[in-house]
């Protein structure tokens, strides 16, 4: 996702993105909440393709690990949180059935707020 | 992206998520910046699967369309911005070559800041 810094902008939450292989992932959670094994390769018409996922999560080394940047601290507590999305992947379930399923992957780092009580 | 409301939380930016078909998308931008046609169906071992994408974008009807929630307005200008990620999809390029390519899809709504000058 585009880097806001190039426009003289800052993100409220610092994130880090990377390409993750199925070998790195090994398992994932599918849409029914079950744990499935992510297969390393996908058969295509002329051979096989490695399964890759583009993942984004909150940067544990970033400035915003203690809270979000730019928040009105008088009124709000804040936290940067990794959010997820679904992508289709070739997987194997606990009964050894192979199939295409939607799995959850990390896709962003967003800021969540809770109101400060009793100031 | 999990709903923060269940924990009494608010998002700094309001988002909306939906399942998008290849028929809805029609085209997408691939990793080299070229426009490709997204094919409606993917051949699998015993038939075909519709290509679906789980997309998240900033909610144009949301409270945060004028700026992010909870920002310290004395010091910052803010904007909710849809960010993108890459997912693999079966596509056809301008030369009618069909293949699996990583395409950009909307995956999140994040807050970006610019510092207020000359207060």
């Amino acid at each position: 996702h585009s880097d806001p810094a190039r426009r003289g902008e800052l993100s409220v939450c610092d994130s880090i993105s990377e390409w993750v292989t199925a070998a790195d992932k090994k398992t994932a959670v599918d849409m029914s909440g079950g744990t499935v094994t992510v297969l390393e390769k996908v058969p295509v018409s002329k051979g096989q393709l490695k399964q890759y996922f583009y993942e984004t999560k909150c940067n544990p080394m970033g400035y915003t690990k203690e809270g979000c940047r730019g928040i009105d601290k008088r009124h709000w507590n804040s936290q940067c949180r990794t959010t997820q999305s679904y992508v289709r992947a070739l997987t194997m379930d606990s009964k050894k059935r192979i199939g295409w399923r939607f799995i959850r992957i990390d896709t962003s780092c967003v800021c969540t707020l809770t109101i400060k009580r009793g100031r | 992206h999990s709903d923060p409301a269940r924990r009494g939380e608010l998002s700094v930016c309001d988002s909306i998520s939906e399942w998008v078909t290849a028929a809805d998308k029609k085209t997408a931008v691939d990793m080299s910046g070229g426009t490709v046609t997204v094919l409606e169906k993917v051949p699998v071992s015993k038939g075909q699967l519709k290509q679906y994408f789980y997309e998240t974008k900033c909610n144009p009807m949301g409270y945060t369309k004028e700026g992010c929630r909870g920002i310290d307005k004395r010091h910052w200008n803010s904007q909710c911005r849809t960010t993108q990620s890459y997912v693999r999809a079966l596509t056809m390029d301008s030369k009618k070559r069909i293949g699996w390519r990583f395409i950009r899809i909307d995956t999140s709504c994040v807050c970006t800041l610019t510092i207020k000058r000359g207060r």
């Epitope: 199939g99 | 999990s2 399942w19 699967l49």
Partner: antibody, heavy 115, light 108 residues
Framework: DVQLVESGGGVVRPGESLRLSCTAS????????MTWVRQPPGKGLELVSH???????YYADSVKGRITVSRDNSNGTLYLQMNSLRVEDTAVYYC?????????WGLGILVTVSS | EIVLTQSPGTLSLSPGERATLTCRAS??????LAWYQQKPGQAPRLLIY???RRATGIPDRFSGSGSGTDFTLTINRLEPEDFAVYYC??????????FGGGTKVEIK
């Protein structure tokens, strides 16, 4: 015990709106996909809309653009906002728990669209 | 979308007999198929999922079989409470999941 209770049905005229609710109890609502299925009088079952745990919505072609599904995880409620209703939307509307198959269903609520 | 065709439309049997209901998919759905029972004025009730797995609390006289495009729901020794409408549903090509048109099992 898992319970799903629909409300908000009734009789409306074509073109009008209605908002159905489904109140869930007995499970962690936020962890489950939820689905609206309808059944016109004397007919079979038809998927209307679906919302996954992460909040993403799917709509059947027959209702796309007229219906909005949403969920409030804080109070365990699923909603179906139906606009520009048509006579062919007349049905019993069920909410069901799940993404793929449905172990738990509400009792259903009747929506009648008639001039 | 995947079309499910159920047959027969109506099955007339006596209590104690065996009922065999079929569901055919327009393309392979693997084993991602469920069966439901619906009685008049009631919500559907899940009987079988993943083609052959019985849902919680379902008696063992109900069994499911098949994979790919052809599926069968068998009810051994029909009980009076088994007379109802039965629907199959696929969740292989999701979304959208689709239902069959139903088979009515009636008392002969």
């Amino acid at each position: 015990d898992v319970q799903l209770v629909e409300s908000g049905g009734g009789v409306v005229r074509p073109g009008e709106s209605l908002r159905l609710s489904c109140t869930a109890s007995g499970f962690d609502f936020s962890r489950y996909g939820m689905t609206w299925v309808r059944q016109p009088p004397g007919k079979g079952l038809e998927l209307v809309s679906h919302i996954v745990d992460l909040g993403g919505a799917y709509y059947a072609d027959s209702v796309k653009g007229r219906i909005t599904v949403s969920r409030d995880n804080s109070n365990g409620t699923l909603y179906l906002q139906m606009n520009s209703l048509r006579v062919e939307d007349t049905a019993v509307y069920y909410c069901a728990r799940g993404n793929t198959f449905f172990e738990y269903w509400g009792l259903g609520i009747l929506v009648t669209v008639s001039s | 979308e995947i079309v499910l065709t159920q047959s027969p439309g109506t099955l007339s049997l006596s209590p104690g007999e065996r009922a065999t209901l079929t569901c055919r998919a327009s393309q392979s759905v693997g084993s991602d198929l469920a069966w439901y029972q619906q009685k008049p004025g009631q919500a559907p009730r899940l009987l079988i999922y993943d083609s052959s797995r019985r849902a919680t609390g379902i008696p063992d006289r109900f069994s499911g079989s098949g994979s790919g495009t052809d599926f069968t729901l068998t009810i051994n020794r029909l009980e009076p409470e088994d007379f109802a409408v039965y629907y199959c549903q696929q969740y292989y090509d999701w979304p959208p999941l689709t239902f069959g048109g139903g088979t009515k099992v009636e008392i002969k």
